[in-house]
């Protein structure tokens, strides 16, 4: 194989659908890693800085999009209440096993070394409250109290 085909993934995190939250009181975050080659990746979910395994469903293997491109998806399911807390932080991390420091790499593009690529999101209050305004509200309430 031509080592120049080695490519790290682009990682995207998709927020839960309003329909799922309304109908099932559950919230599924979807992580998508695309465009990587070869298919040497490990995907993990982190909530509030800690790795989680409960509620996680990851594709059993990467799907071949084209000759030199794979994709992998994973889902994290949490309660709607948990998702609606804007202080909760969600991160999907993909470790891509690329080239080592010893591997040669030609001029013209960055060397795709082993690396971690992440996508993240904060929980969303269902009335348009942001993390900042939520924390400001908590601070105000504490002062008033």
């Amino acid at each position: 194989e031509d080592l120049r085909n080695v490519t790290p993934p682009k990682v995207s995190l998709f927020e839960p659908s309003k329909a799922e939250i309304a109908n099932k009181q559950k919230a599924t975050l979807v992580c998508l890693a695309r465009g990587f080659f070869p298919d040497h990746v490990e995907l993990s979910w982190w909530v509030n800085g800690k790795e989680v395994h409960s509620g996680v469903s990851t594709d059993p293997q990467a799907y071949k999009e084209s000759n030199y491109s794979y994709c992998l998806s994973s889902r994290l399911r949490v309660s709607a209440t948990f998702w609606h807390n804007p202080r909760n932080h969600f991160r999907c991390q993909v470790q891509f096993h690329g080239l080592s420091e010893e591997d040669k790499w030609p001029e013209g593009s960055p060397k795709p070394v082993t690396q971690n690529i992440s996508a993240e999101a904060w929980g969303r209050a269902d009335c348009g409250i942001t993390s900042a305004s939520y924390q400001q509200g908590v601070l105000s309430a504490t002062i008033l109290y």
Partner: antibody
Framework: EVYLVESGGDLVQPGSSLKVSCAAS????????MYWVRQAPGKGLEWVGR??????????EYADSVRGRFTISRDDSRNSIYLQMNRLRVDDTAIYYC???????????WGQGTMVTVSS | YELIQPSSASVTVGETVKITCSGD??????AYWFQQKSDKNILLLIY???KRPSGIPERFSGSTSGTTATLTISGAQPEDEAAYYC???????????FGSGTQLTVLR
């Protein structure tokens, strides 16, 4: 067809400034890192510097002999790179070439060069 | 950092000649080879140690072993009379450096 065309070479005095250009066509310019190479009369090739593309924040690197005096820039909308040369010295006299390198193409096309002469 | 090449080499038409390029970073970084004839045009002959671009005759080949890269011309032709340069990179920034160049004379 890929073309690289350098221009702007001139006869200038030591200590002065000059800006030379390289216009590219026939390929997706923004996908490529671009390079300046020079050749003094009767001498060998010398790497001057490179400018990377936007995914690499247009990072530049320079040879020790020109660092601090020369600046490479690029304009992806014009498919062009530039070499701003300040505090020119007699030993900067050379033909200046541009070339390209990308993920699957490395130094495969070169311009015809533009002559810069620094003399009093 | 330097890439060391012999300043000159000669070969009889139809014979084989090897041009070397030595540098202590060559085990870590790829070598490229270029030809420059008297018209000053620069032509890529070999990239990534041993790959030949389309359109380059098969008589040109490249190899590396340890700290030495080698350009081999098998069955040299009169039109191969030219200067040959190796190129590689070094250091944290992958700065580039050319070899000092080898002037090849093809004897009839």
């Amino acid at each position: 067809e890929v073309y690289l065309v350098e221009s702007g070479g001139d006869l200038v005095q030591p200590g002065s400034s000059l800006k030379v250009s390289c216009a590219a066509s026939g390929f997706t310019f923004s996908d490529f890192w671009m390079y300046w190479v020079r050749q003094a009369p009767g001498k060998g090739l010398e790497w001057v510097g490179r400018i990377k593309n936007i995914p690499n924040n247009y990072a530049t690197e320079y040879a020790d002999s020109v660092r601090g005096r020369f600046t490479i820039s690029r304009d992806d909308s014009r498919n062009s790179i530039y070499l701003q040369m300040n505090r020119l010295r007699v030993d900067d006299t050379a033909i200046y070439y541009c070339t390209r390198a990308g993920r699957f193409d490395h130094f495969d096309y070169w311009g015809q060069g533009t002559m810069v002469t620094v003399s009093s | 950092y330097e890439l060391i090449q012999p300043s000159s080499a000669s070969v009889t038409v139809g014979e084989t000649v090897k041009i070397t390029c030595s540098g202590d970073q060559l085990p870590k970084n790829f070598a490229y080879w270029f030809q420059q004839k008297s018209d000053k045009n620069i032509l890529l002959l070999i990239y990534m140690d041993n790959k030949r671009p389309s359109g380059i005759p098969e008589r040109f080949s490249g190899s590396t072993s340890g700290t030495t890269a080698t350009l081999t011309i098998s069955g040299a032709q009169p039109e191969d009379e030219a200067a040959y340069y190796c190129l590689s990179s070094y250091g944290d920034n992958n700065d580039l450096v050319f070899g000092s160049g080898t002037q090849l004379t093809v004897l009839r």
